[in-house]
C-alpha cells in the first residue's frame, strides 16, 4: 500500500512510516463496521493532510470527508474539496491554510457512500497536531578560541517553536543532545580543536502556542572541526553544500554557512 | 513493520572474497545508520562495521579493517558488506541492525542473518 | 577501544527467581549502554538503551540501572520466555563493543 504524501521536509513520500498515531479526542461511530481512524497534522501551518487507511475496509471503498469547526463562525460542514488516493481509492483529505483554524475544535467525519449510517465523527485539536518543517540555514560562529555558537531558522513558525540540537564528533557512536527554547541558538563552550563535530537540530510546536508531540525532521547536518590546515586550526571544515564565507567578508567574524546562504550573501 | 533480510553468506575457502547484502524495508532507509553484526558459531555478538545514514562516514571494528568495506545504495534501501582476504575466523553469522532514532543510537531492529563459512 | 565485561557468563535460575547480570566498561561511558536478548537460532532483541530506559513492547519485568563503568540488568521475576543469552553492547565510540555474553538457563 503506498500513499503519496508530503512529508515535513516538503518532499514526497511513499512510506508507511509518515503515519503517526494521535488519538482522537472524542469518538463515535455508528453501524457495525468501524471506519478506519483519520490521523491529521498541520504541515507548518501551511497545509494539513488527514489521512486514514484505506486498506483496512473489507472492499475498496472511497470514504468521503466532511469537517467543521465546532462552536464557531466556521461551523458549516464542509466537503473535502482536495482528496488524497492510494491505488485509486480515496485514503485521505488535504485543506490548505485557508481552511485550518487552529485554536477552534476541529471536526472530522469519514463516511461511507454507500452506506450513510457508517459514519464516525473525532475531534481534534489542531494546535496539538503541527509538524513544522526541518530547521534550516545552520550556521556556526566561533565565540572564541573553544566556543562555537549554532544558529539556524525555522520557516514561520519561530517564536512557537522549542528545538532539540544534537552533536557529536567523529568517533561518537551516540549524540549529545540539549533542548532549546524559542530563541534558536545554542553555545557548545569547550571544543576539541583536533575533532570532527556533526551538529543537527529539530523543532517542536510546544509550549507557547500549541502542544504538540511530533519533532520536524531533522535539518541537514552542518559539520565543524579537525581536518583543517595546521596554520589554523579553527579554519571551519568545508563540508557538501556549505562553503567558508572569508572574515573580510564578514567583518572578521567567521561563519560556516550553506550554499544557498552564500548566493544570497553574494548577491544582495 | 521494519524488515531487514540479508543474503549472499555460502561456503568459500580462505582468502576469498564473498558480498552479503542487507534489503530494508518498512521504514525510510536513507535516514538511518546500519550495521553488521556477526556471531561466530557457540560465540557472542561482535560488531563489524558501520555506516551513517548518508555514507559519509563508516567505521570498522580492527578484526576486519582494511579487509571488509561496508556500503549502501540508499537508492535501492540496500546494505552491503564486501568481505575479502576472508580467513577461518570469519566464519560466523552475519546479521545487519538498524540504528534507532534516539540519542543513544542502539539497534532496535535485527534481520535473521546468514552464514558464512569460511573452510577449505 | 572500550572493553566490556559480562558477568556470569552462564546462569542457572528458576521460574520466578530474580535474576541479576552486570556488566563493566574498561573506561566510563556514562549511561551509553544497551542490552540484548538472544534466543537460540534467532537474531538479538533491544531490551534496554540508555542504561535504564525500556524498550517499547518490552515486559517490565526487565530494568537496568548504572552509570560511568558498572551497569545492571535485573529480570523481577524470571518466565519461561525468559531463558536465553543477555548481552550488554556500549553505544558511546567507535569501535562498538559488546560484553561477552550471559547464556540464562533452566535450572
Known amino acids: 500500500l503506498n500513499t503519496t504524501i508530503l512529508t515535513p521536509n516538503g518532499n514526497e513520500d511513499t512510506t508507511a512510516d509518515f503515519f503517526l498515531t494521535t488519538m482522537p479526542t472524542d469518538s463515535l461511530s455508528v453501524s457495525t463496521l468501524p471506519l478506519p481512524e483519520v490521523q491529521c497534522f498541520v504541515f507548518n501551518v501551511e497545509y494539513m493532510n488527514c489521512t486514514w487507511n484505506s486498506s483496512s475496509e473489507p472492499q475498496p471503498t472511497n470514504l468521503t470527508l466532511h469537517y467543521w469547526y465546532k462552536n464557531s463562525d466556521n461551523d458549516k460542514v464542509q466537503k473535502c474539496s482536495h482528496y488524497l488516493f492510494s491505488e485509486e481509492i480515496t485514503s485521505g483529505c488535504q485543506l490548505q491554510k485557508k481552511e485550518i483554524h487552529l485554536y477552534q475544535t476541529f471536526v472530522v467525519q469519514l463516511q461511507d457512500p454507500r452506506e450513510p449510517r457508517r459514519q464516525a465523527t473525532q475531534m481534534l485539536k489542531l494546535q496539538n497536531l503541527v509538524i513544522p518543517w526541518a530547521p534550516e540555514n545552520l550556521t556556526l560562529h566561533k565565540l572564541s578560541e573553544s566556543q562555537l555558537e549554532l544558529n539556524w531558522n525555522n520557516r514561520f513558525l519561530n517564536h512557537c517553536l522549542e528545538h532539540l540540537v544534537q552533536y557529536r564528533t567523529d568517533w561518537d557512536h551516540s549524540w549529545t543532545e540539549q533542548s532549546v527554547d524559542y530563541r534558536h541558538k545554542f553555545s557548545l563552550p569547550s571544543v576539541d580543536g583536533q575533532k570532527r563535530y556533526t551538529f543537527r537540530v529539530r523543532s517542536r510546536f510546544n509550549p507557547l502556542c500549541g502542544s504538540a508531540q511530533h519533532w520536524s525532521e531533522w535539518s541537514h547536518p552542518i559539520h565543524w572541526g579537525s581536518n583543517t590546515s595546521k596554520e589554523n586550526p579553527f579554519l571551519f571544515a568545508l563540508e557538501a553544500e556549505q562553503k567558508l564565507i572569508s572574515e573580510e567578508d564578514l567583518g572578521g567574524e567567521q561563519k560556516l554557512i550553506s550554499e544557498e546562504d552564500l548566493h544570497h550573501h553574494h548577491h544582495h | 513493520q521494519v524488515q531487514l533480510v540479508e543474503s549472499g553468506g555460502g561456503v568459500v575457502q580462505p582468502g576469498r572474497s564473498l558480498r552479503l547484502s542487507c534489503a530494508a524495508s518498512?521504514?525510510?532507509?536513507?535516514?538511518?545508520?546500519m550495521h553488521w553484526v556477526r556471531q561466530a558459531p557457540g560465540k557472542g555478538l561482535e560488531w563489524v562495521a558501520g555506516i551513517l545514514y548518508d555514507g559519509s562516514s563508516k567505521y570498522y571494528a580492527d578484526s576486519v579493517k582494511d579487509r571488509f568495506t561496508i556500503s549502501r545504495d540508499n537508492s535501492k534501501n540496500t546494505l552491503f558488506l564486501q568481505m575479502n582476504s576472508l580467513r577461518a575466523e570469519d566464519t560466523a553469522m552475519y546479521y545487519c541492525?538498524?540504528?534507532?532514532?534516539?540519542?543513544?543510537?542502539?539497534?532496535?531492529?535485527w534481520g535473521p542473518g546468514t552464514l558464512v563459512t569460511v573452510s577449505s | 577501544d572500550i572493553q566490556l565485561t559480562q558477568s556470569p557468563s552462564f546462569l542457572s535460575a528458576s521460574v520466578g527467581d530474580r535474576v541479576t547480570i552486570t556488566c563493566w566498561a574498561s573506561q566510563g561511558i556514562s549511561s551509553y549502554l544497551a542490552w540484548y536478548q538472544q534466543k537460540p537460532g534467532k537474531a538479538p532483541t533491544l531490551l534496554i538503551y540508555a542504561a535504564s530506559t525500556l524498550q517499547s513492547g518490552v515486559p517490565s519485568r526487565f530494568s537496568g540501572s548504572g552509570s560511568g563503568t558498572e551497569f545492571t540488568l535485573t529480570i523481577s521475576s524470571l518466565q519461561p520466555e525468559d531463558f536465553a543469552s543477555y548481552y550488554c553492547?556500549?553505544?558511546?565510540?567507535?569501535?562498538?563493543?559488546f560484553g561477552g555474553g550471559t547464556k540464562v538457563e533452566i535450572k
Open positions: 553492547q556500549q553505544l558511546k565510540s567507535y569501535p562498538l563493543t
Open positions: 541492525a538498524k540504528e534507532e532514532d534516539t540519542a543513544m543510537v542502539p539497534f532496535d531492529s
Open positions: 518498512g521504514f525510510n532507509f536513507r535516514n538511518f545508520g
